[in-house]
Interface confidence: low
Protein backbone atom coordinates (compact mmCIF):
# COMPACT_ATOMS: atom_id res chain seq x y z
CA UNK A 1 0.00 0.00 0.00
CA UNK A 2 3.02 2.29 0.27
CA UNK A 3 4.12 1.93 -3.35
CA UNK A 4 4.58 5.01 -5.52
CA UNK A 5 1.49 4.04 -7.54
CA UNK A 6 -1.28 3.70 -5.00
CA UNK A 7 -3.46 0.65 -5.07
CA UNK A 8 -6.31 -0.06 -2.68
CA UNK A 9 -5.48 0.71 0.94
CA UNK A 10 -4.97 -2.47 2.94
CA UNK A 11 -4.22 -1.48 6.55
CA UNK A 12 -3.46 -5.10 7.43
CA UNK A 13 -0.38 -4.99 5.20
CA UNK A 14 0.98 -1.76 6.70
CA UNK A 15 4.29 -2.07 8.57
CA UNK A 16 3.74 -1.84 12.34
CA UNK A 17 4.53 1.34 14.24
CA UNK A 18 6.80 1.04 17.27
CA UNK A 19 4.77 -0.36 20.19
CA UNK A 20 5.24 2.85 22.15
CA UNK A 21 4.11 5.09 19.34
CA UNK A 22 6.02 7.82 17.52
CA UNK A 23 8.22 10.31 19.30
CA UNK A 24 7.35 13.18 16.93
CA UNK A 25 3.81 12.11 16.11
CA UNK A 26 2.31 10.13 13.23
CA UNK A 27 1.82 10.96 9.56
CA UNK A 28 0.51 8.89 6.62
CA UNK A 29 2.44 7.43 3.74
CA UNK A 30 2.44 8.87 0.20
CA UNK A 31 -0.86 7.15 -0.52
CA UNK A 32 -2.47 8.39 2.68
CA UNK A 33 -2.95 4.82 3.78
CA UNK A 34 -0.38 3.54 6.26
CA UNK A 35 0.49 5.37 9.46
CA UNK A 36 4.18 6.27 9.78
CA UNK A 37 6.32 8.01 12.34
CA UNK A 38 7.02 11.65 11.51
CA UNK A 39 10.69 12.32 10.91
CA UNK A 40 12.88 14.57 13.02
CA UNK A 41 15.47 17.11 11.98
CA UNK A 42 18.21 15.61 9.82
CA UNK A 43 16.23 12.42 9.25
CA UNK A 44 15.50 11.11 5.73
CA UNK A 45 12.24 12.02 4.04
CA UNK A 46 10.49 11.97 0.71
CA UNK A 47 12.50 9.14 -0.83
CA UNK A 48 11.74 5.61 -1.87
CA UNK A 49 12.14 2.53 0.30
CA UNK A 50 13.48 3.20 3.78
CA UNK A 51 14.03 6.84 2.88
CA UNK A 52 10.33 7.58 2.43
CA UNK A 53 8.82 9.65 5.18
CA UNK A 54 7.19 12.88 6.19
CA UNK A 55 8.59 15.53 8.46
CA UNK A 56 7.24 16.52 11.85
CA UNK A 57 5.39 19.83 12.30
CA UNK A 58 7.61 22.89 11.93
CA UNK A 59 9.90 21.08 9.48
CA UNK A 60 10.11 20.72 5.73
CA UNK A 61 11.60 18.07 3.47
CA UNK A 62 14.52 19.51 1.54
CA UNK A 63 15.77 17.37 -1.32
CA UNK A 64 19.45 16.58 -0.96
CA UNK A 65 21.71 17.07 -4.00
CA UNK A 66 23.09 13.55 -3.88
CA UNK A 67 21.08 10.52 -2.91
CA UNK A 68 21.93 8.82 0.37
CA UNK A 69 24.18 5.81 -0.11
CA UNK A 70 22.40 2.51 -0.23
CA UNK A 71 18.94 4.01 -0.68
CA UNK A 72 16.56 2.98 -3.40
CA UNK A 73 15.23 5.82 -5.49
CA UNK A 74 14.55 7.15 -8.94
CA UNK A 75 16.84 9.42 -10.92
CA UNK A 76 17.41 12.95 -9.67
CA UNK A 77 14.18 14.87 -9.62
CA UNK A 78 12.02 11.76 -9.71
CA UNK A 79 9.62 10.61 -6.96
CA UNK A 80 12.30 8.47 -5.31
CA UNK A 81 14.69 11.35 -4.67
CA UNK A 82 15.57 11.41 -1.02
CA UNK A 83 15.74 14.51 1.15
CA UNK A 84 16.20 15.40 4.77
CA UNK A 85 13.91 17.12 7.23
CA UNK A 86 15.08 20.61 8.10
CA UNK A 87 13.64 23.17 10.42
CA UNK A 88 11.62 25.94 8.82
CA UNK A 89 13.05 28.43 11.32
CA UNK A 90 16.81 27.90 11.17
CA UNK A 91 18.03 30.41 13.74
CA UNK A 92 19.41 29.44 17.16
CA UNK A 93 17.10 29.60 20.15
CA UNK A 94 17.66 29.52 23.87
CA UNK A 95 15.88 26.84 25.87
CA UNK A 96 14.56 27.09 29.41
CA UNK A 97 17.23 24.56 30.37
CA UNK A 98 19.89 27.18 29.59
CA UNK A 99 21.00 25.42 26.39
CA UNK A 100 21.28 27.07 22.98
CA UNK A 101 19.64 24.96 20.26
CA UNK A 102 20.55 25.44 16.58
CA UNK A 103 16.83 25.62 15.76
CA UNK A 104 13.40 25.58 17.34
CA UNK A 105 12.91 22.08 15.98
CA UNK A 106 15.90 20.75 17.85
CA UNK A 107 14.59 22.42 20.98
CA UNK A 108 11.19 20.75 20.47
CA UNK A 109 12.86 17.37 19.93
CA UNK A 110 14.95 17.84 23.08
CA UNK A 111 11.81 18.76 24.98
CA UNK A 112 10.05 15.61 23.85
CA UNK A 113 13.04 13.51 24.83
CA UNK A 114 13.10 15.21 28.23
CA UNK A 115 9.39 14.60 28.77
CA UNK A 116 9.75 10.96 27.76
CA UNK A 117 12.38 10.64 30.51
CA UNK A 118 10.01 12.19 33.02
CA UNK A 119 11.82 15.53 33.04
CA UNK A 120 10.25 18.97 32.63
CA UNK A 121 9.42 20.13 29.11
CA UNK A 122 11.93 22.58 27.61
CA UNK A 123 10.45 25.83 26.37
CA UNK A 124 11.91 28.59 24.23
CA UNK A 125 13.11 31.43 26.42
CA UNK A 126 14.39 33.66 23.64
CA UNK A 127 15.64 33.76 20.09
CA UNK A 128 19.39 33.70 19.68
CA UNK A 129 22.09 32.08 21.71
CA UNK A 130 21.70 31.34 25.35
CA UNK A 131 24.61 31.72 27.64
CA UNK A 132 26.41 35.03 27.64
CA UNK A 133 28.97 36.65 29.85
CA UNK A 134 27.88 39.54 32.04
CA UNK A 135 27.65 43.04 30.65
CA UNK A 136 27.03 46.29 32.49
CA UNK A 137 23.67 47.76 31.48
CA UNK A 138 23.87 50.82 33.73
CA UNK A 139 27.23 51.58 35.37
CA UNK A 140 27.52 53.45 38.67
CA UNK A 141 27.97 57.24 38.43
CA UNK A 142 30.57 59.40 40.18
CA UNK A 143 29.28 61.12 43.30
CA UNK A 144 30.39 64.31 45.10
CA UNK A 145 28.90 65.09 48.46
CA UNK A 146 29.54 66.46 51.92
CA UNK A 147 30.30 64.51 55.09
CA UNK A 148 27.14 63.36 56.85
CA UNK A 149 25.15 63.00 53.63
CA UNK A 150 23.36 59.85 52.49
CA UNK A 151 24.54 58.66 49.07
CA UNK A 152 24.19 55.56 46.92
CA UNK A 153 25.82 53.97 43.91
CA UNK A 154 23.80 51.70 41.66
CA UNK A 155 24.80 49.17 39.03
CA UNK A 156 22.66 47.12 36.66
CA UNK A 157 24.12 44.02 34.98
CA UNK A 158 22.83 41.27 32.68
CA UNK A 159 24.11 37.83 31.69
CA UNK A 160 23.03 34.25 31.19
CA UNK A 161 23.16 32.53 33.62
CA UNK A 162 22.12 35.47 35.81
CA UNK A 163 25.35 37.00 37.13
CA UNK A 164 26.44 37.30 40.74
CA UNK A 165 27.06 40.95 41.61
CA UNK A 166 29.54 42.11 44.25
CA UNK A 167 30.98 45.47 45.23
CA UNK A 168 34.65 46.21 45.94
CA UNK A 169 36.42 49.30 47.11
CA UNK A 170 39.53 49.79 45.00
CA UNK A 171 42.59 50.85 46.97
CA UNK A 172 45.52 52.21 45.02
CA UNK A 173 48.87 51.51 46.66
CA UNK A 174 52.44 52.44 45.78
CA UNK A 175 53.50 52.42 42.12
CA UNK A 176 49.90 52.22 40.97
CA UNK A 177 49.34 48.71 42.33
CA UNK A 178 45.69 48.26 43.27
CA UNK A 179 43.94 45.90 45.61
CA UNK A 180 40.28 45.54 46.35
CA UNK A 181 38.32 45.27 49.53
CA UNK A 182 35.08 43.30 49.37
CA UNK A 183 32.17 45.38 50.64
CA UNK A 184 30.47 45.89 53.02
CA UNK A 185 33.32 44.58 55.18
CA UNK A 186 32.96 45.69 58.80
CA UNK A 187 31.73 49.19 58.03
CA UNK A 188 28.61 50.19 59.94
CA UNK A 189 27.68 53.12 57.69
CA UNK A 190 27.60 51.04 54.51
CA UNK A 191 24.96 48.62 53.23
CA UNK A 192 24.75 46.49 50.10
CA UNK A 193 21.45 45.64 48.44
CA UNK A 194 20.89 43.40 45.42
CA UNK A 195 17.73 42.37 43.63
CA UNK A 196 16.84 40.59 40.43
CA UNK A 197 15.60 42.58 37.46
CA UNK A 198 14.26 44.75 36.05
CA UNK A 199 14.58 42.31 33.12
CA UNK A 200 15.03 38.52 33.16
CA UNK A 201 18.68 37.57 33.87
CA UNK A 202 19.35 41.10 35.11
CA UNK A 203 20.61 42.03 38.55
CA UNK A 204 20.68 45.50 40.10
CA UNK A 205 22.86 46.28 43.08
CA UNK A 206 23.27 49.31 45.32
CA UNK A 207 25.86 50.55 47.79
CA UNK A 208 24.23 52.83 50.37
CA UNK A 209 26.51 55.03 52.46
CA UNK A 210 25.02 56.89 55.41
CA UNK A 211 26.41 58.97 56.95
CA UNK A 212 29.18 59.74 54.46
CA UNK A 213 32.62 60.20 55.99
CA UNK A 214 36.04 61.18 54.62
CA UNK A 215 37.12 57.52 54.85
CA UNK A 216 34.39 56.58 52.34
CA UNK A 217 36.03 58.58 49.57
CA UNK A 218 37.53 56.50 46.77
CA UNK A 219 36.77 54.23 43.85
CA UNK A 220 33.98 51.68 44.09
CA UNK A 221 33.78 48.77 41.67
CA UNK A 222 30.67 46.87 40.67
CA UNK A 223 31.81 43.38 39.62
CA UNK A 224 29.56 40.82 37.88
CA UNK A 225 30.47 37.24 37.09
CA UNK A 226 28.88 34.06 35.75
CA UNK A 227 30.08 30.86 34.14
CA UNK A 228 30.69 32.69 30.88
CA UNK A 229 32.87 35.51 32.13
CA UNK A 230 32.97 38.68 34.15
CA UNK A 231 32.53 42.43 33.79
CA UNK A 232 33.09 45.42 36.01
CA UNK A 233 32.52 49.15 36.15
CA UNK A 234 33.57 51.67 38.72
CA UNK A 235 32.69 55.11 40.03
CA UNK A 236 34.29 57.52 42.48
CA UNK A 237 32.86 58.98 45.65
CA UNK A 238 34.44 62.32 46.43
CA UNK A 239 33.85 63.81 49.88
CA UNK A 240 33.97 67.61 50.05
CA UNK A 241 33.80 70.02 52.99
CA UNK A 242 31.06 72.23 51.67
CA UNK A 243 28.30 72.00 49.07
CA UNK A 244 29.72 74.89 47.02
CA UNK A 245 32.77 72.69 46.28
CA UNK A 246 30.62 70.21 44.30
CA UNK A 247 31.14 70.82 40.57
CA UNK A 248 27.86 71.13 38.68
CA UNK A 249 27.85 70.15 35.01
CA UNK A 250 25.49 72.09 32.78
CA UNK A 251 22.00 70.63 33.13
CA UNK A 252 22.95 68.38 36.04
CA UNK A 253 22.72 68.64 39.75
CA UNK A 254 24.80 66.93 42.38
CA UNK A 255 23.55 63.49 43.41
CA UNK A 256 22.39 64.01 46.96
Amino acid sequence: SSSDTCGPCEPASCPPLPPLGCLLGETRDACGCCPMCARGEGEPCGGGGAGRGYCAPGMECVKSRKRRKGKAGAAAGGPGVSGVCVCKSRYPVCGSDGTTYPSGCQLRAASQRAESRGEKAITQVSKGTCEQGPSIVTPPKDIWNVTGAQVYLSCEVIGIPTPVLIWNKVKRGHYGVQRTELLPGDRDNLAIQTRGGPEKHEVTGWVLVSPLSKEDAGEYECHASNSQGQASASAKITVVDALHEIPVKKGEGAEL
Partner: antibody, heavy 121, light 110 residues
Protein backbone atom coordinates in the same frame (compact mmCIF):
# COMPACT_ATOMS: atom_id res chain seq x y z
CA UNK B 1 8.15 -8.66 12.21
CA UNK B 2 11.13 -7.07 13.93
CA UNK B 3 14.16 -9.36 14.10
CA UNK B 4 17.63 -8.78 15.55
CA UNK B 5 20.02 -11.61 14.73
CA UNK B 6 23.34 -11.55 16.56
CA UNK B 7 26.70 -13.13 15.80
CA UNK B 8 30.39 -12.87 16.64
CA UNK B 9 30.53 -14.16 20.21
CA UNK B 10 32.98 -16.78 21.41
CA UNK B 11 35.87 -17.64 23.69
CA UNK B 12 38.74 -15.16 23.73
CA UNK B 13 41.85 -14.62 25.82
CA UNK B 14 42.24 -11.56 28.08
CA UNK B 15 43.68 -8.59 26.20
CA UNK B 16 42.41 -9.82 22.84
CA UNK B 17 39.64 -8.40 20.65
CA UNK B 18 36.25 -9.52 19.40
CA UNK B 19 33.62 -7.94 17.14
CA UNK B 20 29.92 -8.53 17.66
CA UNK B 21 27.37 -8.01 14.89
CA UNK B 22 23.62 -7.53 14.92
CA UNK B 23 21.62 -7.83 11.68
CA UNK B 24 18.28 -6.04 11.80
CA UNK B 25 15.15 -6.66 9.75
CA UNK B 26 11.43 -5.96 9.88
CA UNK B 27 11.75 -2.23 10.57
CA UNK B 28 13.37 0.86 9.08
CA UNK B 29 16.77 0.41 10.68
CA UNK B 30 18.05 3.92 9.97
CA UNK B 31 15.15 5.48 11.85
CA UNK B 32 16.16 4.15 15.24
CA UNK B 33 18.92 4.31 17.82
CA UNK B 34 20.45 0.96 18.77
CA UNK B 35 22.09 -0.34 21.93
CA UNK B 36 24.18 -3.12 23.43
CA UNK B 37 23.22 -4.49 26.85
CA UNK B 38 25.08 -7.29 28.59
CA UNK B 39 24.28 -9.83 31.29
CA UNK B 40 27.09 -11.54 33.19
CA UNK B 41 26.38 -15.18 34.21
CA UNK B 42 23.77 -15.23 36.97
CA UNK B 43 23.76 -11.42 37.15
CA UNK B 44 21.54 -8.53 36.11
CA UNK B 45 21.42 -6.34 33.02
CA UNK B 46 24.08 -3.70 32.31
CA UNK B 47 23.82 -1.11 29.54
CA UNK B 48 27.05 -1.10 27.53
CA UNK B 49 26.67 1.36 24.67
CA UNK B 50 24.20 3.17 22.43
CA UNK B 51 24.27 4.90 19.06
CA UNK B 52 21.73 7.28 17.52
CA UNK B 53 20.11 6.70 14.12
CA UNK B 54 22.78 8.65 12.22
CA UNK B 55 25.76 7.85 14.52
CA UNK B 56 25.73 11.49 15.60
CA UNK B 57 25.34 10.61 19.26
CA UNK B 58 27.22 7.74 20.91
CA UNK B 59 27.42 6.74 24.57
CA UNK B 60 29.34 4.18 26.60
CA UNK B 61 29.18 2.81 30.13
CA UNK B 62 32.21 3.83 32.20
CA UNK B 63 33.24 0.18 32.49
CA UNK B 64 33.90 -0.10 28.72
CA UNK B 65 34.87 3.47 27.79
CA UNK B 66 38.07 3.56 25.74
CA UNK B 67 37.97 -0.19 25.04
CA UNK B 68 34.70 -0.77 23.18
CA UNK B 69 33.50 0.97 20.01
CA UNK B 70 29.92 0.92 18.77
CA UNK B 71 29.16 1.52 15.10
CA UNK B 72 26.43 0.95 12.57
CA UNK B 73 26.09 0.52 8.81
CA UNK B 74 22.63 1.73 7.80
CA UNK B 75 23.10 0.48 4.24
CA UNK B 76 23.56 -3.05 5.62
CA UNK B 77 21.00 -2.70 8.45
CA UNK B 78 23.74 -3.76 10.84
CA UNK B 79 24.99 -2.79 14.28
CA UNK B 80 28.49 -3.62 15.57
CA UNK B 81 30.41 -3.68 18.83
CA UNK B 82 34.20 -3.77 18.55
CA UNK B 83 35.59 -5.00 21.87
CA UNK B 84 39.31 -4.48 22.50
CA UNK B 85 41.51 -5.19 25.54
CA UNK B 86 38.97 -7.69 26.82
CA UNK B 87 38.95 -8.57 30.52
CA UNK B 88 37.53 -11.50 32.48
CA UNK B 89 34.79 -9.21 33.81
CA UNK B 90 33.55 -8.63 30.23
CA UNK B 91 32.36 -12.25 30.17
CA UNK B 92 28.61 -12.02 29.56
CA UNK B 93 25.69 -12.61 27.27
CA UNK B 94 25.56 -9.55 24.99
CA UNK B 95 22.21 -8.37 23.65
CA UNK B 96 21.64 -5.93 20.82
CA UNK B 97 18.45 -3.92 21.34
CA UNK B 98 16.37 -1.40 19.40
CA UNK B 99 15.43 1.96 20.88
CA UNK B 100 11.94 3.37 20.40
CA UNK B 101 13.36 6.54 18.87
CA UNK B 102 16.07 7.84 16.58
CA UNK B 103 17.78 9.55 19.45
CA UNK B 104 18.93 7.73 22.55
CA UNK B 105 15.97 7.43 24.89
CA UNK B 106 17.32 4.04 25.99
CA UNK B 107 13.85 2.58 26.04
CA UNK B 108 14.30 -0.80 24.42
CA UNK B 109 11.30 -2.32 22.68
CA UNK B 110 12.98 -5.20 20.80
CA UNK B 111 15.96 -7.36 21.77
CA UNK B 112 18.20 -9.81 19.93
CA UNK B 113 18.65 -13.41 21.06
CA UNK B 114 21.99 -12.64 22.70
CA UNK B 115 25.52 -13.81 21.94
CA UNK B 116 27.93 -15.19 24.53
CA UNK B 117 31.37 -13.68 25.07
CA UNK B 118 33.74 -15.63 27.33
CA UNK B 119 37.06 -14.04 28.27
CA UNK B 120 39.38 -16.63 29.77
CA UNK B 121 42.96 -17.79 29.46
CA UNK C 1 26.25 -3.40 43.09
CA UNK C 2 23.32 -1.96 41.13
CA UNK C 3 22.39 1.72 41.37
CA UNK C 4 18.69 0.78 41.62
CA UNK C 5 17.85 -1.66 44.42
CA UNK C 6 15.34 -4.48 43.93
CA UNK C 7 14.54 -7.40 46.24
CA UNK C 8 16.34 -10.52 44.97
CA UNK C 9 13.15 -12.59 44.98
CA UNK C 10 9.42 -12.49 45.62
CA UNK C 11 6.93 -15.32 45.49
CA UNK C 12 3.21 -15.85 45.54
CA UNK C 13 0.54 -18.42 44.90
CA UNK C 14 -1.42 -18.38 41.63
CA UNK C 15 -4.05 -15.64 41.69
CA UNK C 16 -2.21 -13.65 44.35
CA UNK C 17 -0.93 -10.10 43.95
CA UNK C 18 2.81 -9.53 44.24
CA UNK C 19 4.74 -6.27 44.22
CA UNK C 20 8.37 -5.60 43.29
CA UNK C 21 10.01 -2.45 44.54
CA UNK C 22 12.77 -0.49 42.81
CA UNK C 23 14.54 2.01 45.05
CA UNK C 24 16.78 4.73 43.67
CA UNK C 25 18.02 8.08 44.86
CA UNK C 26 17.71 11.80 44.24
CA UNK C 27 20.07 11.53 41.26
CA UNK C 28 17.92 9.05 39.32
CA UNK C 29 14.29 8.20 40.10
CA UNK C 30 14.04 11.07 42.60
CA UNK C 31 15.35 13.50 39.98
CA UNK C 32 12.17 12.92 37.98
CA UNK C 33 13.49 10.35 35.51
CA UNK C 34 11.06 7.74 34.22
CA UNK C 35 11.24 4.10 35.28
CA UNK C 36 10.79 1.23 32.81
CA UNK C 37 10.35 -2.46 33.58
CA UNK C 38 11.52 -5.50 31.63
CA UNK C 39 10.50 -9.15 31.99
CA UNK C 40 13.04 -11.90 31.26
CA UNK C 41 11.57 -15.36 31.00
CA UNK C 42 14.04 -18.22 31.65
CA UNK C 43 16.48 -18.62 28.76
CA UNK C 44 15.10 -15.74 26.73
CA UNK C 45 15.95 -12.10 26.01
CA UNK C 46 14.33 -9.36 28.11
CA UNK C 47 10.99 -7.95 26.98
CA UNK C 48 9.65 -4.46 27.62
CA UNK C 49 6.83 -4.74 30.14
CA UNK C 50 6.12 -1.22 31.47
CA UNK C 51 7.46 2.09 30.17
CA UNK C 52 7.24 5.63 31.51
CA UNK C 53 6.45 4.43 35.06
CA UNK C 54 3.00 3.05 34.35
CA UNK C 55 2.35 2.50 30.62
CA UNK C 56 1.90 -0.93 29.06
CA UNK C 57 2.99 -1.66 25.48
CA UNK C 58 0.36 -3.41 23.38
CA UNK C 59 0.21 -7.11 24.12
CA UNK C 60 1.14 -6.84 27.79
CA UNK C 61 -1.71 -8.12 30.01
CA UNK C 62 -3.40 -5.54 32.23
CA UNK C 63 -2.58 -7.55 35.33
CA UNK C 64 0.84 -5.86 35.13
CA UNK C 65 0.91 -2.31 36.45
CA UNK C 66 3.61 0.17 37.42
CA UNK C 67 3.80 3.21 39.65
CA UNK C 68 6.37 5.69 40.87
CA UNK C 69 6.63 7.85 43.97
CA UNK C 70 9.56 9.91 45.18
CA UNK C 71 12.80 7.97 44.83
CA UNK C 72 11.21 4.59 44.22
CA UNK C 73 8.98 2.74 41.79
CA UNK C 74 7.08 -0.51 41.94
CA UNK C 75 5.73 -3.18 39.63
CA UNK C 76 2.59 -5.05 40.64
CA UNK C 77 1.35 -8.34 39.23
CA UNK C 78 -2.30 -8.93 40.08
CA UNK C 79 -3.63 -12.44 39.66
CA UNK C 80 -0.24 -14.15 39.44
CA UNK C 81 -0.02 -16.86 36.78
CA UNK C 82 2.47 -19.67 36.21
CA UNK C 83 3.78 -17.97 33.05
CA UNK C 84 4.74 -14.89 35.09
CA UNK C 85 7.63 -16.82 36.64
CA UNK C 86 10.60 -14.77 35.40
CA UNK C 87 13.21 -12.18 36.31
CA UNK C 88 12.03 -8.56 36.37
CA UNK C 89 14.31 -5.54 35.97
CA UNK C 90 13.66 -1.86 36.52
CA UNK C 91 15.57 0.71 34.46
CA UNK C 92 15.98 4.46 34.76
CA UNK C 93 18.53 7.22 34.16
CA UNK C 94 21.08 8.68 36.49
CA UNK C 95 22.56 12.15 36.24
CA UNK C 96 26.04 10.70 36.70
CA UNK C 97 25.87 7.18 35.26
CA UNK C 98 23.42 7.72 32.41
CA UNK C 99 21.53 4.41 32.06
CA UNK C 100 20.94 2.33 35.17
CA UNK C 101 19.25 -1.01 35.80
CA UNK C 102 18.10 -2.65 39.00
CA UNK C 103 19.73 -5.89 40.10
CA UNK C 104 16.65 -7.90 39.10
CA UNK C 105 13.96 -9.74 41.03
CA UNK C 106 13.11 -13.42 40.55
CA UNK C 107 9.38 -14.03 40.76
CA UNK C 108 8.43 -17.56 41.79
CA UNK C 109 4.89 -18.91 41.46
CA UNK C 110 4.29 -21.33 44.32
Amino acid sequence: QVQLVQSGGGLVQPGRSLRLSCAASGFTFDDYAMHWVRQAPGKGLEWVSGISWNSGSIGYADSVKGRFTISRDNAKNSLYLQMNSLRAEDTALYYCAKDISGSQLVLLDYWGQGTTVTVSS
Amino acid sequence: QSVLTQPPSVSGAPGQRVTISCTGSSSNIGAGYDVHWYQQLPGTAPKLLIYGNSNRPSGVPDRFSGSKSGTSASLAIAGLQAEDEADYYCQSYDSSLSVVFGGGTKVTVL
